[in-house]
Interface confidence: low
Amino acid sequence: FSGDGRAIWSKNPNFTPVNESQLFLYDTFPKNFFWGIGTGALQVEGSWKKDGKGPSIWDHFIHTHLKNVSSTNGSSDSYIFLEKDLSALDFIGVSFYQFSISWPRLFPDGIVTVANAKGLQYYSTLLDALVLRNIEPIVTLYHWDLPLALQEKYGGWKNDTIIDIFNDYATYCFQMFGDRVKYWITIHNPYLVAWHGYGTGMHAPGEKGNLAAVYTVGHNLIKAHSKVWHNYNTHFRPHQKGWLSITLGSHWIEPNRSENTMDIFKCQQSMVSVLGWFANPIHGDGDYPEGMRKKLFSVLPIFSEAEKHEMRGTADFFAFSFGPNNFKPLNTMAKMGQNVSLNLREALNWIKLEYNNPRILIAENGWFTDSRVKTEDTTAIYMMKNFLSQVLQAIRLDEIRVFGYTAWSLLDGFEWQDAYTIRRGLFYVDFNSKQKERKPKSSAHYYKQIIRENGFSL
């Protein structure tokens, strides 16, 4: 329950819920553990204005803010080389593929009228191919590529008009794809959408410094998610029988002084201000965390009692993202002067305590390598082994209900403000080549082995 996560940082064995610490655990994951891998449409599809696709805020942002990037026209060209992506998925042997739909590829100006036929065909073909391979699709409706027209006409997520427009788009996706999709994600990491899109200006649409806008955007994202959940729950779940959530991302943090209660309070405040901002309304009591309401009363919108009731419980599982985008650069306000840490196990324990031990899908996890690293990505293997070991310990030692893991990412691609200077794929792509071959990196071989053995064998 709210505030209980503080116990994670207590070094007193009577308080800490992290039962047993060991460097490594040789064990298997639960029998039907859900192994997968993910991509984001804008990062890998390319073809940013091909076949009737409309521009997104990121296409615009790239041309106006990232001067050294020609466009996402290159990228990994997944729109063109769908078969190559499918072969890569076959190679690894995943149970699911998490990908996002490009909203402006379906509806060029964002408004749901007649869908762009070529866009519809692309996603339909992809879904059919996954079903044929017995690979479960996990589909994200919004991974940051808002149709530019909606930004220009309404001011994007600052305007609550977008909520209904997003719901219309979601309805269309449920109608067209819901027969093949059992797992839906509404929005990927809304914290970054709000904070970097409207606070630091590092993400599209690149607006800076308006704290009221940051929290208005967050508010509208939560309300949009909730509306879509209720829509799915009422109109689609009865016959499609799927699940729907929102991917929430966070860092982890450790106190400067491990025995210092005020530093521990700051760590709690840090987690609450990032993860709790979105998790509390959706997975908690339907409202913003108490501390945020008090400290941000002048800029944080208010949920009415009816809205709190509407927000509460609008996720069928806890989709959690833990990767570099929440760490670099971390909002200094969120750090509270404490030390960031890559301890995924403790972050999962925090979620367990704060939100009453939910079922958790790790919806994004992984690290990055320098763009010059090709297929010998030893650092990525080290990081993956470390993260997976922490997940396994969370499951086996802490009884946390993690049911699936999404390695990020399938392919090298466009990495937001880092553009093409880093790589996150398990498959190497030479962006300058015509054929964009997917070459398995060492990490792809490693992940393949983990999946085959369902964990770590001695």
Partner: antibody
Framework: QVTLKESGPVLVKPTETLTLTCTVS??????????VSWIRQPPGKALEWLAH???????SYSTSLKNRLTISKDTSKSQVVLIMTNMDPVDTATYYC????????????????WGQGTTVTVSS | SYVLTQPPSVSVAPGQTARITCGGN??????VHWYQQKPGQAPVLVVY???DRPSGIPERFSGSNSGNTATLTISRVEAGDEADYYC???????????FGGGTKLTVL
């Protein structure tokens, strides 16, 4: 009903050591959301915070008095003890203990229950 | 260390509104608590976390906090409100409790 009661000597001599005890009831000192502070108030003057003990046994002391203070607790007896060495007439004051409660996870909601105070005079 | 500044005294006629301020560097980012102390008695918490009231405290007592000033507002002041009022914060940097110097409220 939550209560705190201070006890200790009414009179101490300069250079002596003062030991004050705060006995609590209605809540447990092991509760992860509870802490206890000692505060004093010289006659006609403002409140001055002295020390705090957190539920996990962490302690915090006033910078100006840090070298003279020791706070501790005995959970089984529901007592918090403050020891103040090298007493001086300027330490003459009413000494209070007060409870702080954590809610919302990461800050204290003020001192919601106070003892009635014990008056200590330092004189030879 | 963190310093909280209060006016030594505030006077107000019965039925009027009293405002007692507490100044501190960027105090708006801290949680401020207010105590009432009547002569010969222990302090009583009247407002916590800037603006919340403990049970039993009349609605006439309210608080606000932004920028460099926190304010305790007592509306429709009564003779029984005459007391010393102290603001308090936890200074997270030093891990210390800090009290203001106190304000004597006189009801004319």
């Amino acid at each position: 009903q939550v209560t705190l009661k201070e006890s200790g000597p009414v009179l101490v001599k300069p250079t002596e050591t003062l030991t004050l005890t705060c006995t609590v009831s209605g809540f447990s000192l092991s509760n992860a959301r509870m802490g206890v502070s000692w505060i004093r108030q010289p006659p006609g003057k403002a409140l001055e915070w002295l020390a705090h003990i957190f539920s996990n046994d962490e302690k915090s002391y006033s910078t100006s008095l840090k070298n003279r203070l020791t706070i501790s607790k005995d959970t089984s007896k529901s007592q918090v003890v403050l020891i103040m060495t090298n007493m001086d007439p300027v330490d003459t004051a009413t000494y209070y203990c007060a409870r702080s409660v954590v809610t919302g996870g990461y800050y204290y909601d003020g001192m919601d229950v106070w003892g009635q105070g014990t008056t200590v005079t330092v004189s030879s | 260390s963190y310093v909280l500044t209060q006016p030594p005294s505030v006077s107000v006629a019965p039925g009027q509104t009293a405002r007692i301020t507490c100044g501190g560097n960027n105090i708006g980012s801290e949680s401020v608590h207010w105590y009432q102390q009547k002569p010969g008695q222990a302090p009583v918490l009247v407002v916590y976390d800037d603006s919340d009231r403990p049970s039993g405290i009349p609605e006439r007592f309210s608080g606000s906090n932004s920028g460099n000033t926190a304010t305790l507002t007592i509306s429709r002041v009564e003779a029984g409100d005459e007391a010393d009022y102290y603001c308090q914060v936890w200074d997270g940097n030093s891990d210390h409790v800090v009290f203001g110097g106190g304000t004597k409220l006189t009801v004319l």
